[in-house]
Amino acid sequence: ALDTNYCFRNLEENCCVRPLYIDFRQDLGWKWVHEPKGYYANFCSGPCPYLRSADTTHSTVLGLYNTLNPEASASPCCVPQDLEPLTILYYVGRTPKVEQLSNMVVKSCKCS
Amino acid sequence: ALDTNYCFRNLEENCCVRPLYIDFRQDLGWKWVHEPKGYYANFCSGPCPYLRSADTTHSTVLGLYNTLNPEASASPCCVPQDLEPLTILYYVGRTPKVEQLSNMVVKSCKCS
């Protein structure tokens, strides 16, 4: 699987999950998030050669088409597969609130 | 929606579904498919600027991060959203068989 366990340990040029730290205030302008100050959102990147973690029949077909037609511009793209939530602390005035934000952290990627 | 109705009628540079005709024999080397000879598989391409048909909170966050950090290499990618099956005719010996191949035709795209 193209997950953090594999991708963070290997120098993988092809589609893989990459580490990306986002600072809420500096990178997003989100002053309302109190904790954490930032988090590893991660992202997916890298070429999708034929059959690399293909998501659907279409992506497999497109990968094969691309292999046999190297000049073609149509190819699968490396995108998130598994995402995890992130728990944040924010304040409503002086009252602390805890919220779980869904689909915030990329754990693995696929070729789609 | 970034679907064929919209994308095929507009000169859209950003993420959209594009027409792509695949000839089974010539483009894939699939001699076993008898009918159709080929089909419009289509594909997704084009930049994913901030908030364009964002798929998840992560892709929205990544788009926002990218907007505020233009030098960043992490950005969402244009990939299939809705896929449709394709019915094909092939032969097992002299016996015709009809099969529905799932997820063969891209009908719309998203930024993921």
Partner: antibody, heavy 120, light 108 residues
């Protein structure tokens, strides 16, 4: 420049619902919280609630809970306030306003206001 | 909820006079959860002061704010004709946000 443009005036019957829109431009929409404030004719200001775009976290004044829904459409940079089960006393100008950044905060930019009239 | 009591309800002063409006909270707001707004007829409120004493961008220096805890004040050092408006204080320490009832400022 920062602008918040609201939808036009509405006349509604008691018991019905109204949905007011507020389209933001001139700043990074998803970086700020949007609050809604209403003002009855000749009266003072009353906070309705606030919403955080992208994550759609909404906070409401207790008196409106169950009747008001605040949502944000990040694809169009638009925030919506829907108020249901309208009463004559809901007749007011409804303003959307951008906060300085926190969920409860001062409000630095305001929409032009939308007059909602509730009358039988 | 926190009740904000503004005084006076109305004020009529001469041009160039000093204006002071006070705002009292029913419970402590700490030092920074208070804002002041100006509203002219038919217009939306305009933020003047936030964090009790910080002037919003573009607001003339004749406007100032001070205070902490439960007692806050707003001052116009020298009244100008364009200052005729209703002024509101607002607390954002606790939900719901609440406003004072307003002070109507006129020129004699």
């Amino acid at each position: 420049q920062v602008q918040l443009v609201q939808s036009g005036a509405e006349v509604k019957k008691p018991g019905s619902s109204v949905k007011v829109s507020c389209k933001a431009s001139g700043y990074t929409f998803s970086s700020n919280v949007i609050s809604w404030v209403r003002q009855a004719p000749g009266k003072g200001l009353q906070w309705v609630g606030g919403v955080i775009p992208i994550v759609d976290i909404a906070n409401y004044a207790q008196r409106f809970k169950g009747r008001v829904t605040l949502t944000a459409d990040t694809s169009t940079n638009t925030v919506y306030m829907e108020l249901s089960n309208l009463r004559t006393e809901d007749t007011a100008v409804y303003y959307c306003a951008r906060t300085l950044g926190l969920v409860l905060d001062a409000m630095d930019y305001w929409g032009q206001g939308t007059l909602v009239t509730v009358s039988s | 909820e926190i009740v904000m009591t503004q005084s006076p309800a109305s004020l009529s002063l001469s041009q160039e006079e000093k204006v002071t409006i006070t705002c009292r909270a029913s419970q402590s707001l700490g030092s920074s959860y208070l804002a002041w707004y100006q509203q002219k007829p038919g217009q939306a409120p305009k933020l003047l002061i936030y964090g009790a004493s910080s002037r919003a961008p573009g607001v003339p220096s004749r406007f100032s704010g001070s205070g902490s805890g439960t007692d806050f004040s707003f001052t116009i050092s020298s009244l100008e004709p364009e200052d005729v408006a209703v002024y509101y204080c607002q607390q954002y320490a606790d939900s719901p946000i609440t406003f004072g009832q307003g002070t109507k400022l006129e020129i004699k």
